[in-house]
């Protein structure tokens, strides 16, 4: 199960999808930054249908969503966005 | 012109089964999510299920699920409903539509004539 | 899952009246909203979406507004063939629809 907090010294993702999925579909998306053993930034799509999904951070549309959820306040989110905590 | 027409519908008993197929025209068929929406006789809309490009990913509302199984077929340009242990409730006419999206939002934009199912015994 | 709350459900007005239609959603939709015309027998037909963006070939007496939790679909002044039922959906999280407004004609 994957936590939304939780550090490792690797990279969590295995695969990569850049195929669009709405925002109507999607429960939440976890950030992980580059760094802590691991060399690249990762998005992480928890989908409405309780599957999970890594999506490629260089994907338009996510760059395109990302800006626009956050545009709004975080009390308004429809999606809410969690990043890691670094320690 | 966009073109989306259902079929399969008709009259089951509680119970039963059924299987709607929706042909679709008129634009590029993989380019886009498509769903089913439903309206009971002299009710509102209601939607049921959605399908992503492939159909490897779907989404259900919580009354149909493990009952109700969208599919699609990309080469035959057709949208499938598989409706099992079908309940009186599920009467309705049952609509394709087409889900047009920009940055995630907006949706629905074509939509079928409706096929009529009918569970009564 | 989202809620969305429409009223009224139903409406008599004239031709030539300015009507207004509202939708309340449980939580913030964040202007992910349609509005449908549907008449008997037919299909819906997609009027606004995004909360104002005016469908194509849609008459600019239709329009729309809101935020939040709020919307509202307004028709300036009535035309006869605008008697029909209106529904809004939210599509922020999965979809939800309105329960109907039917417009007959006073």
């Known amino acids: 199960v994957l936590e939304v907090y939780y550090t490792s010294l690797r990279c969590r993702c295995v695969q990569e999808s850049s195929v669009f999925i709405p925002r109507r579909f999607i429960d939440r998306i976890q950030i992980l930054p580059r760094g802590n053993g691991c060399p690249r930034k990762e998005i992480i799509v928890w989908k409405k249908n309780k599957s999970i999904v890594c999506v490629d951070p260089q994907a338009e549309w996510i760059q395109r969503m990302m800006e626009v959820l956050r545009k709004r306040s975080s009390s308004t989110l429809p999606v809410p966005v969690f990043k890691r905590k670094i320690p | 012109e966009v073109q989306l027409v259902e079929s399969g519908g008709g009259l089951v008993q509680p119970g039963g089964s059924l299987r709607l197929s929706c042909a679709a025209s008129?634009?590029?068929?993989?380019?886009?999510?498509m769903a089913w929406v439903r309206q009971a006789p002299g009710k509102g809309l209601e939607w049921v299920a959605s399908?992503?490009?492939?159909?490897?990913?779907?989404y259900y509302r919580d009354s149909v699920k493990g009952r109700f199984t969208i599919s699609r077929d990309n080469a035959k340009n057709s949208l499938y409903l598989q409706m099992n242990s079908l309940r009186a409730e599920d009467t309705a006419v049952y609509y394709c539509?087409?889900?047009?999206?920009?940055?995630?939002?907006?949706?629905?934009?074509?939509w079928g004539q409706g096929t009529l199912v009918t569970v009564s015994s | 899952d989202i809620q969305m709350t429409q009223s009224p459900s139903s409406l008599s007005a004239s031709v030539g009246d300015r009507v207004t239609i509202t939708c309340k959603a449980s939580q913030n939709i964040n202007k992910e909203l349609t509005w449908y015309q549907q008449k008997p027998g037919k299909a819906p037909k997609r009027l606004i979406y995004?909360?104002?963006i005016l469908q194509t070939g849609i008459p600019s007496r239709f329009s729309g507004s809101g935020s939040g939790t709020e919307y509202t679909l307004t028709i300036s002044s009535l035309q006869p063939e605008d008697f029909a039922t209106y529904f809004c959906?939210?599509?922020?999280?999965?979809?939800?629809f309105g329960q109907g407004t039917k417009l007959e004609i006073k």
């Open positions: 008129g634009f590029t068929f993989s380019d886009y999510y």
């Open positions: 995004n909360t104002n």
């Open positions: 399908i992503n490009y492939d159909g490897g990913d779907t």
């Open positions: 959906l939210q599509q922020s999280s999965l979809y939800t």
């Open positions: 539509a087409r889900e047009e999206d920009y940055d995630g939002s907006y949706v629905m934009d074509a």
